[in-house]
């Protein structure tokens, strides 16, 4: 269940996909990745107000309980719903190899 | 990849399973659920310090970028890794029915 996509906090403030440019140095990969040397990291950032992009019933429960017990129960959190694979060309003992990582770049976001 | 399970913030402070008791009124279910009248809601609560229970490479990247750009990139978030099913007995137009919900109670937690 993907509930409301309308953000009550104003445009761009709620859970959505953002792109952050990062160097291999930023990621701690400089010594083993040859290409790309710079990564466009897609990640899920933003607030999860009531029922916004609720991933499932657990997220809906969390919203209800957060409203009642905000000090105990946190609001739902903006996380990846799916991923885009990323291809890294990396150094190996014998030379170089092509490696795909399936859980590296967020493709779509929801609140949970 | 499930990284370190040792919490550097002290016992019970990091991402883990918590149980929160909630009534049907709390959950907004009073008008359609007959049983149970009270639910032991298991949810994931707690901090996600560096590499603690990192769900995947995306979580590891998020940790690295949060360290570099804390105002732009949030820390990973404590969310369910899996769920326990829950059976609800609910009112229907014709009487009552037994319904299983697979995405309601957190079973295990990780940081993402």
């Amino acid at each position: 269940a993907r509930n409301g996509d309308h953000c009550p906090l104003g445009p761009g403030r709620c859970c959505r996909l953002h792109t952050v440019r990062a160097s291999l140095e930023d990621l701690g990969w400089a010594d083993w990745v040859l290409s790309p040397r710079e990564v466009q990291v897609t990640m899920c950032i933003g607030a999860c107000p009531s029922q916004f992009r609720a991933a499932n019933m657990h997220a809906q429960i969390k919203t209800s309980l957060h409203r009642l017990k905000p000090d105990t129960v946190p609001a739902p959190c903006c996380v990846p719903a799916s991923y885009n694979p990323m291809v890294l060309i990396q150094k190996t003992d014998t030379g170089v190899s092509l490696q795909t990582y399936d859980d590296l770049l967020a493709k779509d976001c929801h609140c949970i | 990849a499930r990284n370190g399970d040792h919490c550097p913030l002290g016992p019970g402070r990091c991402c883990r399973l918590h149980t929160v008791r909630a009534s049907l009124e709390d959950l907004g279910w009073a008008d359609w659920v007959l049983s149970p009248r009270e639910v032991q809601v298991t949810m994931c609560i707690g901090a996600c310090p560096s590499q603690f229970r990192a769900a995947n490479m995306h979580a590891q990247i998020k940790t690295s970028l949060h360290r570099l750009k804390p105002d732009t990139v949030p820390a990973p978030c404590c969310v369910p890794a899996s769920y326990n099913p829950m059976v609800l007995i609910q009112k229907t137009d014709t009487g009552v029915s037994l319904q299983t919900y697979d995405d309601l109670l957190a079973k295990d937690c990780h940081c993402i």
Epitope: L34, P36, R37, L98 | -
Partner: antibody, heavy 118, light 107 residues
Framework: QVQLVQSGAEVKKPGASVKVSCKAS????????INWVRQAPGQGLEWMGW????????AYAQELQGRVTMTTDTSTSTAYMELRSLRSDDTAVYYC???????????WGQGTLVTVSS | EIVMTQSPATLSVSPGERATLSCRAS??????LAWYQQKPGQAPRLLIY???TRATGIPARFSGSGSGTEFTLTISSLQSEDFAVYYC?????????FGGGTKVEIK
């Protein structure tokens, strides 16, 4: 925007060598590798190899090993592919293709026709 | 090396009709598959990567599906500009390999 501009068509004799260039612009050259792909007339696409514009590390197709050399010049943002001991079946359009983090690439040079004929 | 086999070699379709192109890998390539369109005298153009993700600027009538060894490119309603040769490409392992192509021609 990303652009890859290749050198002009070449006609070579069997046994000779050819060196095709690929000048990149619109991005940081050493951030991505360059693949070389060729296409014989009326045929499909064949991957020849890859070079890191950052380190110069290479990976070549096995059947071309020993005949092909890929290099880069970061000062001019140019990649080169040299093929030696040319044969008639090396007649093809040669493309340079930039890496992307997603695998498939929208960034191809316009192609260089190399004709090997006696 | 991974062998990519495309079928049919030629597909005759009327404008406005649906076209379904197949690509089979000799071993699993997961979702590491791209589709390209090539017109005479031009470089290939990326349509789909990750088996199902449309590249920037590619119309919604192009869709990709499949994983492992069986993949499909579907063009929901052929436009005149879609008549071309289509190639699948695996990038799961080196050497990168391409299928032999499917020519989509006007019926």
């Amino acid at each position: 925007q990303v652009q890859l501009v290749q050198s002009g068509a070449e006609v070579k004799k069997p046994g000779a060598s050819v060196k095709v260039s690929c000048k990149a612009s619109g991005y940081t050259f050493d951030s991505y590798g360059i693949n070389w792909v060729r296409q014989a007339p009326g045929q499909g696409l064949e991957w020849m190899g890859w070079i890191s514009a950052y380190s110069g590390d290479t990976a070549y197709a096995q059947e071309l090993q020993g005949r092909v050399t890929m290099t880069t010049d970061t000062s001019t943002s140019t990649a080169y592919m040299e093929l030696r001991s040319l044969r008639s079946d090396d007649t093809a359009v040669y493309y340079c293709v930039r890496d992307t983090q997603y695998g498939g690439s929208p960034y191809w040079g316009q192609g260089t026709l190399v004709t090997v004929s006696s | 090396e991974i062998v990519m086999t495309q079928s049919p070699a030629t597909l005759s379709v009327s404008p406005g009709e649906r076209a379904t192109l197949s690509c089979r890998a000799s071993q699993s390539v997961s979702s590491n598959l791209a589709w390209y369109q090539q017109k005479p005298g031009q470089a290939p153009r990326l349509l789909i990567y990750g088996a199902s993700t449309r590249a920037t600027g590619i119309p919604a009538r192009f869709s990709g599906s499949g994983s492992g060894t069986e993949f499909t490119l579907t063009i929901s309603s052929l436009q005149s500009e879609d008549f071309a040769v289509y190639y699948c490409q695996q990038y799961n392992n080196w050497p990168i390999t391409f299928g032999g192509g499917t020519k989509v021609e006007i019926k």
